[in-house]
């Protein structure tokens, strides 16, 4: 299973100091799911890690980057079937002998605990309960992410009093 989808648009302006201010809406595109400050898109097919990376690019997004354990937990809470795995944007850099996120940063030791080998052609996937390494050529579903985009609310100020 996968998370219920279709609930993307949320007004997250927390600090309204004046009732005459026009709120800004942070919106996920249609079909994307909002999780905190990100929009996530879960694939409905399977691919090796490289293909997954490329496919997210076609959606002007990237494979999922996980900043900390809290974000990992939030994402895993969306996975309702323990048998399903998703590629994320982390793989092993042979030259630097370390796990490397696709944004160029390295995995810090207290971020995620990866079960499995740290070796050439290893990529990382998440399941409902864990984080694993696997050959990058393995076929899995994947998760794309993009940042929430700011959309000016065109509603008159009185409408949200």
């Amino acid at each position: 299973q996968k998370p219920s989808i279709g609930k993307c648009s949320v007004d997250i302006q927390q600090n309204r100091t004046k009732t005459t201010e026009r709120p800004d809406l942070l919106n996920c595109p249609i079909y994307w799911q909002q999780v905190q400050e990100k929009c996530l898109l879960f694939s409905h097919t399977v691919n090796p890690w490289n293909n997954s990376l490329a496919d997210c690019s076609t959606k002007e997004s990237s494979l999922l980057l996980i900043q900390d354990k809290d974000e990992l937990t939030r994402t895993q809470n969306l996975i309702h079937d323990k048998a399903i795995s998703f590629w994320i944007g982390l793989n092993f850099s042979l030259s630097e002998k370390n796990w490397k996120w696709i944004n160029g940063s390295f995995l810090s030791s207290n971020d995620l605990k990866i079960t499995g080998d740290a070796k050439e052609n290893s990529c990382v996937y998440i399941s409902q309960t864990s984080v694993y390494s696997e050959y990058c050529s393995t076929e899995m579903k994947w998760i794309c992410q993009k940042e929430l985009t700011l959309v000016r609310n065109k509603v008159s100020p009185d409408s949200w009093l």
């Epitope: 219920s4 989808i5 694939s43 409905h44 079937d81 076929e139």
Partner: antibody
């Protein structure tokens, strides 16, 4: 235009296997995931699994995982679904169906269906 | 598994009628619902995706609505070619499931 043409009707005995083919035309075969769905007489539709024709990667409905094999031959733009250890309740029309989008689970083109009858 | 219950199972109507078919999900599926039309002996044809988005080439008399657990397909003015079976599908989970279908017949 997009066309999915399936192989002809099959009659099989219980315990046998059946292999159904689905030839695609009118689009890039490797660009769209192929699914298999079946419809038993008087019953609803049941999703069986998918294959990514570009890579050969598969994902199956757990119900069929031990009996189904999905393959493809990109040189002839054809997907295959083989179901083994057939039982009488496998009697159904089997459809191939193209996934319309990598990120949504709808089927925008279907084959004409292949009737598989399992009878002793 | 998510169960989809369609109602009615059978529907008799006349050309020009407005008809509504309902699909109820056993749990929240967001808007990840699809509607198909199927004529006897033919393959299903995609009508609507994401609960309300008409597929390319589908006449405007077909419309879909709903979210969560209750969805409707409406045909605003029945045409002779609309008499067929209709069924819904959810893809909120990776185990795609389908409704039992609604047979739309000429009165």
């Amino acid at each position: 235009q997009v066309q999915l043409v399936q192989s002809g009707a099959e009659v099989k005995k219980p315990g046998a296997s059946v292999k159904v083919s689905c030839k695609a035309s009118g689009y890039s075969f490797t660009g769209y995931t192929m699914n298999w769905v079946r419809q038993a007489p008087g019953q609803g539709l049941e999703w069986m699994g998918l294959i990514n024709p570009n890579t050969g990667g598969t994902y199956y409905n757990q119900k069929f995982k031990d009996r189904v094999t999905m393959t493809r031959d990109t040189s002839i733009s054809t997907a295959y679904m083989e179901l083994s250890r057939l039982r009488s309740d496998d009697t159904a029309v089997y459809y191939c169906a193209r996934l319309g989008d990598n990120y949504r689970g709808y089927f925008d083109s279907w084959g004409q269906g292949t009737t598989v009858t399992v009878s002793s | 598994d998510i169960q989809l219950t369609q109602s009615p199972s059978f529907l008799s109507a006349s050309v020009g009628d407005r008809v509504t078919i309902t699909c109820k999900a056993s749990q929240d599926v967001g808007t990840a619902v699809v509607w198909y039309q199927q004529k006897p002996g033919k393959a299903p044809k995609l009508l609507i995706d994401w609960a309300s988005i008409r597929h390319t080439g589908v006449p405007s008399r077909f419309s879909g609505s709903g979210s969560g657990t209750e969805f409707t397909l409406t045909i605003s003015s029945l045409q002779p070619e609309d008499f067929a079976d209709y069924f819904c599908q959810q893809y909120s989970t990776y185990l795609y499931t389908f409704g039992g279908g609604t047979k739309l017949e000429i009165k």
